[in-house]
Structure formats: C-alpha cells, structure tokens
C-alpha cells in the first residue's frame, strides 16, 4: 500500500485547485475505513492502482486520502429552500493526480489518473447518515453509493432511505 508522502507537499493551498472554475471550499487529509474498522488501502499493481478493504496489522500505517469539498446547488427546488438548497460534493485522491471514479457500467470504483477539470464520475455527494460516519453517493447516478463488496469497493444501489444506514455504505474518516 502507498500513502501520501509529506502532508505539506500534497495539501495544496485551497485556492490552488479549481474544477471548472470552482475551488474546493475546504480540504482534509484523512484515512478512510469501513463501519467495521477495516482500512481502505491503495496498491500499485501492473502499472495501475488497486483498491483494497483489509484489516491492517497493529502498527501498519493507514493510507491517507485527500478529500476536497465542493458546494453544489441541489438539482431540484422541491424542498422550498430556493437558493439555499446546497449539497456538499467530494472528490477523493489517494495520491497526486489520481482520483476515485465511479464506473457505473461495471458497478465498480476505480482509481484514474486525470487532469482538471475532473469528470462528473469523480464527484460524490457527501452524506452523514449516521453518527460519525459518512456515505458517498455518485453524482452521475443518484441512489448509487460507494460500498464494500467482497473486500473491494463497489457501487451499490440503495433503494430507499431506510437502507441509507446499511453498514456496507458507511465509512469513517480519521484525520489522525
């Protein structure tokens, strides 16, 4: 597994990065783990990156991910919120120039090298459905979330709001 070498080197000034003219409103460097405390790790294999969900050994370092937060208007005004209907979208980057992408055709989560502006597949709506846990909903496919399947990350369709607390789509962020 690889981590980001040197937080300072990678945590750019907020105004340095822009996506279609929009800068992230904040950024965090955090490790990502499942609801059941398994770590999300990233490994270079055959010149491409693989994503794993695994138990780490006691003193093994957790991989870090840069989460960039963007504001987005809610697509509909049904709520009556008018201009205030904002959502937070995030992009997740475990190493420079690579971002998590939703591959909706394959129902998979992949790491792709790409330049800005990032494609919509790299954006996920942030949900805090549960105390201290977050979920990531595909911008390109509402109702589909990043989840855990067979020790890998996959895209999982959530049919109703009752299922939004399903453990396999809940993740913990830790900045330590």
């Amino acid at each position: 597994a690889f981590g980001i070498s040197g937080v300072q080197k990678y945590t750019r000034a907020l105004h340095d990065s822009s996506i279609t003219g929009i800068s992230p409103i904040t950024e965090y460097l955090a490790s990502l783990s499942t609801y059941n405390d398994q770590s999300i790790t990233f490994a270079l294999e055959d010149e491409s990156y693989e994503i794993y969900v695994e138990d780490l050994k006691k003193d093994e370092k957790k991989d870090k991910v840069l989460l960039s937060y963007y504001e987005s208007q809610h697509p509909s005004n049904e709520s009556g919120d008018g201009v205030d209907g904002k959502m937070l979208m995030v992009t997740l980057s475990p190493t420079k120039d690579f971002w998590l992408h939703a591959n909706n055709k394959e129902h998979s989560v992949e790491l792709h090298k790409c330049e800005k502006p990032l494609p919509d597949q790299a954006f996920f709506v942030l949900h805090n459905m549960h105390s201290n846990c977050v979920s990531f909903e595909c911008k390109t496919d509402p109702g589909v979330f990043i989840g855990v399947k067979d020790n890998h990350l996959a895209l999982i369709k959530v049919d109703s709001s009752e299922n939004l607390c399903t453990e396999n789509i809940l993740f913990k962020l830790s900045e330590t």
Epitope: I25, T26, H74, S79, K86, M129, H130, V134
Partner: antibody
Framework: QVNLLQSGATLVKPGASMKMSCKAS????????VSWVKQSHGKSLEWIGE????????NFNKEFKDKATLTVDKSTSTAYMELTRLTSEDSAVYYC???????????????WGQGTLVTVSS | IIVMTQSPKSMSISVGDRVTMNCKAS??????IAWYRQKPGQSPELLIY???NRYTGVPDRFTGGGYGTDFTLTINSVQAEDAAFYYC?????????FGGGTKVELK
C-alpha cells in the same frame, strides 16, 4: 422560506425536567441535521448536540450527554430537546439551528429559531 | 477541546468606519471557522463560513480571512445595524466551540 419556530419561555423548579420543541417549515425536514445551542445570560454560545431526523442518529457535546435528550417527530417536522435534573446553571436561552447542506452536518448554523428561555428557580 | 479566543472584547466605532476583529484557535483548524453576528435581543445569524465564504444574502462589506490558527472578520463601512456581538466558531469537527465574542458598539 425556512422557519424554525420554538416553544415559549418556561419557568421550572430545580430538579425537574422540561421538554422544548422546534417546529421546522419551508424545507425538507428529514434531509438536514438539527443542532441545539445554549446561551446563558450575557455569555457566549455552547453547542449541545445534533440529530439527523432521517435516521435519528445523534452526536453530543460530552458536557451535555447526561443533561439533554434529542428526539424528532417526522410526521410533524418537529425536533425536541428534553433537559433533565435542572439546576440554576441550566437557566439560559436555547436555540435550535439548521445547517446549510442537505444530508451533511458540518456543524455550521445557517438558520436559527427565535430561542426558548428557560428559567430554573424555586 | 479547541479553545477559540476573540479580541478585542469590545470596540466603539462610528458609522462608515472599517473594523477588524480577531479570532485565535488553540490549535490548527485549517479554514474550519464560521462567524456570526448577534444583534441585541435577536438570534445569531451566519455571516462567514469556511473562513472566507460569505453566506447567502450577507452584504459584501463583511470579509473573512485567515488559515490555521489566526482569523479575522473585517467590516468595511460599518452600518448602524452592525452594532452587535460577533462570535467565531470552529466548524466541521465535534464538538464545535465558540469564541467569547467581540462587542461592537456605535459611538
């Protein structure tokens, strides 16, 4: 427009409990976290805790974990806070608040109720 | 718990003045700061979030700045309605904490 309407001022005796309400309107109640904030007379603000109406999930400031209970009634779009074993230290204005974002709590308080004054006195 | 310290505690200014108040965090909080104004007898209102983002409908005379531990709120050309308490707050992480406030009075 977004409105958080809180219940009226209350005088309670030391040792008693009381429950205040916060009726939300003008937005989708279940999609936003609701927080509660305390302001003692002439003092600053203290965050008590938050609840997500959709799931009932909540987070608390440790200082208030044994003092406050947060609940919601989705059918009436109302959030409640019950305070127990009241002492003079609990005399304050209590605000319910809502953040700016659907689905996500960043513990930012974009909308505020008018406040409920609680006076604890025998 | 991260402690937020505001200065000055109070200031007396005239309409049209430019005023800057400070907020210091006891440890690095990135840009996770919000500012609120509380007029006498009213509920607080959100002015700035994530250190420098003006909230919807907030006049552009309000500007937030800073990163890490030191933050400022500047009011360009103070209006009569700006006589109020101003609070900074650490956001994002639980528990969020507020500063003790800066009171802005008009001469």
């Amino acid at each position: 427009q977004v409105n958080l309407l809180q219940s009226g001022a209350t005088l309670v005796k030391p040792g008693a409990s009381m429950k205040m309400s916060c009726k939300a309107s003008g937005y989708s109640f279940t999609d936003y976290w609701v927080s509660w904030v305390k302001q003692s007379h002439g003092k600053s603000l203290e965050w008590i805790g938050e609840i997500y109406p959709n799931s009932g999930a909540n987070n608390f400031n440790k200082e208030f974990k044994d003092k406050a209970t947060l609940t919601v009634d989705k059918s009436t779009s109302t959030a409640y806070m019950e305070l127990t074993r009241l002492t003079s230290e609990d005399s304050a204005v209590y605000y319910c608040t809502r953040g700016p974002y659907y689905y996500s709590s960043q513990i930012i308080f974009a909308y505020w109720g008018q406040g409920t004054l609680v006076t604890v006195s025998s | 718990i991260i402690v937020m310290t505001q200065s000055p505690k109070s200031m007396s200014i005239s309409v049209g003045d430019r005023v800057t108040m400070n907020c210091k965090a006891s440890q690095n909080v990135g840009n996770n700061i919000a500012w609120y104004r509380q007029k006498p007898g009213q509920s607080p209102e959100l002015l700035i979030y994530y250190a420098s983002n003006r909230y919807t409908g907030v006049p552009d005379r309000f500007t937030g700045g800073g990163y890490g531990t030191d933050f400022t709120l500047t009011i360009n050309s103070v209006q009569a309605e700006d006589a109020a308490f101003y609070y900074c707050q650490r956001i994002y992480n639980s528990p969020p904490t507020f500063g003790g406030g800066t009171k802005v009075e008009l001469k």
